[in-house]
């Protein structure tokens, strides 16, 4: 619009003046006036501001508490927060990753569809017909039943979703 109907995108209104906001990584020390410019200062060590702002205090970087199973995935800068992730074998309980829980194991009869990551839990699936899992595991997929035929054996005991088939020798009495 001409003329402007508000301060410009990176400005804010104070005392009849459109003042520049502080850029990411800096905090506001003093508003601009008729005589002076906006005064901004860089955030200190372990602090950040990730937007154009008029904040008088920077935010503290997130602490990745090892007692909660957390570790630093990406170190924070003056413009970005620290990103935490979980130690091996654990995953975040929320998007903010404030604490971790042990990866879930898939019970016998279930196999791992998707291995857990630092931010997502194990996804299990029931073993379909022809497959089994006889262990509780966070890594094992469902295994296919043994093919007795390819070993020149016969099925002596049918497989289930938790057990493999049992193969045995062919009945020699058969013609």
């Amino acid at each position: 619009p001409e003329p402007p109907t508000a301060c410009r995108e990176k400005q804010y209104l104070i005392n009849s003046q459109c003042c520049s906001l502080c850029q990411p990584g800096q905090k506001l020390v003093s508003d601009c006036t008729e005589f002076t410019e906006t005064e901004c200062l860089p955030c200190g060590e372990s602090e950040f501001l990730d937007t154009w702002n008029r904040e008088t205090h920077c935010h503290q970087h997130k602490y990745c508490d090892p007692n909660l199973g957390l570790r630093v995935q990406q170190k924070g800068t003056s413009e970005t927060d620290t990103i935490c992730t979980c130690e091996e074998g654990w995953h975040c309980t929320s998007e903010a990753c404030e604490s971790c829980v042990l990866h879930r194991s898939c019970s016998p009869g279930f196999g791992v569809k998707q291995i857990a990551t630092g931010v997502s839990d194990t996804i299990c699936e029931p073993c379909p017909v022809g497959f089994f899992s006889n262990v509780s595991s966070a890594f094992e997929k469902c295994h296919p039943w043994t093919s007795c035929e390819t070993k020149d054996l016969v099925v002596q005991q049918a497989g289930t979703n938790k057990t493999d088939v049992v193969c045995g020798p062919q009945d020699r009495l058969r013609a």
Epitope: P3, R8, Q23, E37
Partner: antibody, heavy 125, light 107 residues
């Protein structure tokens, strides 16, 4: 203190292009729109357009559309104005100027509070 | 485009004189008007914005008035450093045009 320092004088042949720079200091460059104004020898002031240094989006006066390009490099707080297909009547002093906005009586009033020292562009064969 | 016509184009005055420059707009521009002072070989300097608001650091002998289509810049007591060319500018409709200028000379 706010300063706008422009590049030095240029002599160009008709049909050529010229690129004038304007380096800002003493304020947050991306926070204020930058304008370009020219002044032919012994003549008045002519508004050419502006650039939003944050987004890089320009707006040009109709008269210069197709011949002028306004850009910026925020990493060095510098705005640029390039004029192509130069003619002898483009001989002028080119100024960059910062926009200030004042709010009063429910309206937002712009004006140009800081100006560069000017860059003389001479177009001559 | 909105035309701004300044009068007079030239003005001879003495130190201590009260000087008035007029700027007429070809259509109403509310208070979207600024005044600038320019000395030879120098960039323009902002004096008045929003038709009547004095820019910080500008001596109080300068004042602006008017709204709509008729505006005035007044120098209450002309000083030696005030001999210069003065321009009005409308900032309501693109292109933001300037008046042709008023040159204030020493009588």
């Amino acid at each position: 203190q706010v300063q706008l320092v422009q590049s030095g004088a240029e002599v160009k042949k008709p049909g050529a292009s010229v690129k004038v720079s304007c380096k800002a200091s003493g304020y947050t460059f991306a926070g204020y729109y930058m304008y370009w104004v020219r002044q032919a020898p012994g003549q008045g002031l002519e508004w050419m357009g502006w650039i939003n240094p944050d987004s890089g989006a320009p707006t040009y006066a109709q008269k210069f559309q197709g011949r002028v390009t306004m850009t910026r490099d925020t990493s060095i707080s510098t705005a640029y104005m390039e004029l192509s297909r130069l003619r002898s009547d483009d001989t002028a002093v080119y100024y960059c100027a910062r926009e200030k906005i004042y709010y009063g009586s429910g309206n937002y009033y712009p004006s140009f509070d800081y100006w560069g020292q000017g860059t003389l562009v001479t177009v001559s064969s | 485009d909105i035309q701004l016509t300044q009068s007079p184009s030239f003005l001879s005055a003495s130190v201590g004189d009260r000087v008035t420059i007029t700027c007429r707009a070809s259509q109403g521009i509310s208070s979207y008007l600024a005044w600038y002072q320019q000395k030879p070989g120098k960039a323009p300097k902002l004096l008045i914005y929003a038709a009547s608001t004095l820019q910080s650091g500008v001596p109080s002998r300068f004042s602006g008035s008017g709204s709509g289509t008729e505006f005035t810049l007044t120098i209450s007591s002309l000083q030696p450093e005030d001999f210069a060319t003065y321009y009005c500018q409308q900032l309501v409709s693109y292109p933001w045009t300037f008046g042709q200028g008023t040159k204030v000379e020493i009588k």
